[in-house]
């Protein structure tokens, strides 16, 4: 069979080889398509409801005024010329529709390096057969499930027209130190050959590189955290990050009910102030980061170092924040 591709909605003429150019003709067309149950026979006499779908022209050709999806199938013509020689024509008709230019919707203007990001959703509407969507990054095709690339695809078919809408959502994990302004594009490749790919306008999101927070330093004064009763301890939380994060304080693993501050002053130390202290820095773009813990203890007169163990008591005493 000869393969014929026809665009949906456009006319199609199939020649009946060997048929006399004008009546009287001995020919018949047989169709097996989505409109027929088994084979439908059409003759030059025509007439009836089929004339609006397909009719035999005076020269024996079959004319379809507007091809539809249901017209995909096999078309055969059997004709006898004036000398009684029989000729057969056999066509396999496939139909297509080129969609509108694909578009990227919900596109991100900024991506974060090192974590998965949604780049955008590529949408192609009105294709037949469905075809495929593919993504490119800086001239290279992106392969799903490789190097932090994932693609969620969805194909919907219009209940009335039978045309396809394709959606492809791209997620990527940009490498740290990679291209700061990558170019993504999406293209539609048709399901039938001979019809060129269609491509979206490219998008160029910026890649934001999160600066790894340097370690949170906790400085204690006096050094070592051992102080005589009634003395003062100053705890300072040093965070190099900019802008300055919020600093909260913990004692024995429990947050202290105090407003954020980088300095914690413990004046007039009493037994209830003994324990393990740490600070927690919370940056707007990072999770919380905790410092090392330091132990604050009371030295009784005559002792040279911190007392063994810590004295109980949950009172905060007279706590001051700088």
């Amino acid at each position: 069979a000869q393969n014929i591709t026809a665009r949906i909605g456009e006319p199609l003429v199939l020649k009946c080889k060997g048929a006399p150019k004008k009546p009287p003709q001995r020919l018949e067309w047989k169709l097996n398509t989505g409109r027929t149950e088994a084979w439908k026979v059409l003759s030059p006499q025509g007439g009836g409801p089929w004339d609006s779908v397909a009719r035999v022209l005076p020269n024996g050709s079959l004319f379809l005024p507007a091809v539809g999806i249901q017209d995909e199938g096999i078309f055969r013509c059997q004709a006898m010329n004036r000398n009684g020689k029989e000729t057969k024509s056999n066509y396999r008709v496939r139909v297509y529709q080129i969609p509108g230019k694909p578009e990227i919707v919900d596109s991100a203007s900024e991506l974060t390096a090192g974590v998965p990001n949604k780049v955008g959703t590529c949408v192609s509407e009105g294709s037949y057969p469905a075809g495929t969507l593919s993504w490119h990054l800086d001239g290279k095709p992106l392969v799903p499930n490789e190097k932090g690339v994932s693609v969620k695809e969805q194909t919907r078919r219009h209940p009335e027209t039978g045309l396809f809408t394709l959606q492809s959502e791209l997620m990527v994990t940009p490498a740290r130190g990679g291209d700061p302004r990558p170019t993504f594009s999406c293209s539609f490749s048709p399901g039938l050959p001979r019809h060129r790919a269609l491509r979206t306008a490219p998008i160029q999101p910026r890649v934001w590189e999160p600066v790894p927070l340097e370690e949170v330093q906790l400085v204690v004064e006096p050094e070592g955290g051992a102080v005589a009763p009634g003395g003062t301890v100053t705890l300072t939380c040093e965070v190099p990050a900019q802008p300055s994060p919020q600093i909260h304080w913990m004692k024995d693993g429990v947050p202290l009910p105090l407003p954020p501050s980088p300095v914690l002053i413990l004046p007039e130390i009493g037994p209830q102030d003994q324990g393990t202290y740490s600070c927690v820095a919370t940056h707007s773009s990072h999770g919380p980061q905790e410092s090392r813990a330091v132990s604050i203890s009371i030295i009784e007169p005559g002792e040279e170092g911190p007392t063994a163990g810590s004295v109980g008591g949950s009172g905060l005493g007279t706590l001051a924040l700088a």
Partner: antibody
Framework: QVQLQQSGAELAKPGASVKMSCRAS????????MHWVKQRPGQGLEWIGF????????EYIPKFKDKATLTADKSSSTAYMQLSSLTSEDSAVYYC???????????WGAGTTVTVSS | DIQMTQSSSYLSVSLGGRVTITCKAS??????LAWYQQKPGNAPRLLIS???TLETGVPSRFSGSGSGKDYTLSITSLQTEDVATYYC?????????FGGGTKLELK
């Protein structure tokens, strides 16, 4: 109309460097990528790499990574290619060609001939 | 990298005749194939993109076909001005690669 105007022929000594230009006109320079292609006398076409003038992203084939440097000046709509540590193997015609993103090369410059000779 | 192979480096042709130039990719390129014509002393000129789409101003005697890895450029009724070297190029993935070229020579 759309044009890519390349600089004139270069004669250079082995070990030297040359910098050639490709001036774009008739379209928005940052909307298209600029590619460079090498053709040695009597030989075929060899893609060197491209620059995206909008983002200044560049890509080279490995053999040209240390040989070619692609740059672009948006203000003058000009792309440049510098070739360093020249040898006789670098004697060739170098073409610039534009593409709409990662697409075919629809407009080409006339080429710059580089001759490396002592 | 995707390799492009043009099986004939030279083709001996007759004016008015039909010419077929073939190009094979080492991997599927999804119809992302271009054909260029180059005449001596000139820059290449784009003839066909998307494997089959003729560029504006290119005579209709040129046509492109193929799919998957195999592609063809055809010239019917060859004219004197068609005597040139023809290159295929894939732009499915960087590094973009050209075929070795096919030079047409008059018989």
């Amino acid at each position: 109309q759309v044009q890519l105007q390349q600089s004139g022929a270069e004669l250079a000594k082995p070990g030297a460097s040359v910098k050639m230009s490709c001036r774009a006109s008739g379209y928005t320079f940052t909307d298209y990528w600029m590619h460079w292609v090498k053709q040695r006398p009597g030989q075929g076409l060899e893609w060197i790499g491209f620059i995206n003038p909008s983002t200044v992203y560049t890509e080279y084939i490995p053999k040209f990574k240390d040989k070619a440097t692609l740059t672009a000046d948006k203000s003058s709509s000009t792309a440049y290619m510098q070739l360093s540590s020249l040898t006789s193997e670098d004697s060739a015609v170098y073409y610039c060609a534009r593409s709409d993103g990662g697409w075919y090369f629809d407009v080409w410059g006339a080429g710059t001939t580089v001759t490396v000779s002592s | 990298d995707i390799q492009m192979t043009q099986s004939s480096s030279y083709l001996s042709v007759s004016l008015g005749g039909r010419v077929t130039i073939t190009c094979k990719a080492s991997d599927r390129i999804n119809y992302w194939l271009a054909w260029y014509q180059q005449k001596p002393g000139n820059a290449p000129r784009l003839l066909i993109s998307g494997a089959t789409t003729l560029e504006t101003g290119v005579p209709s005697r040129f046509s492109g076909s193929g799919s998957g890895k195999d592609y063809t450029l055809s010239i019917t009724s060859l004219q004197t001005e068609d005597v040139a070297t023809y290159y295929c190029q894939q732009y499915w993935s960087t590094p973009y690669t050209f075929g070795g070229g096919t030079k047409l020579e008059l018989k």
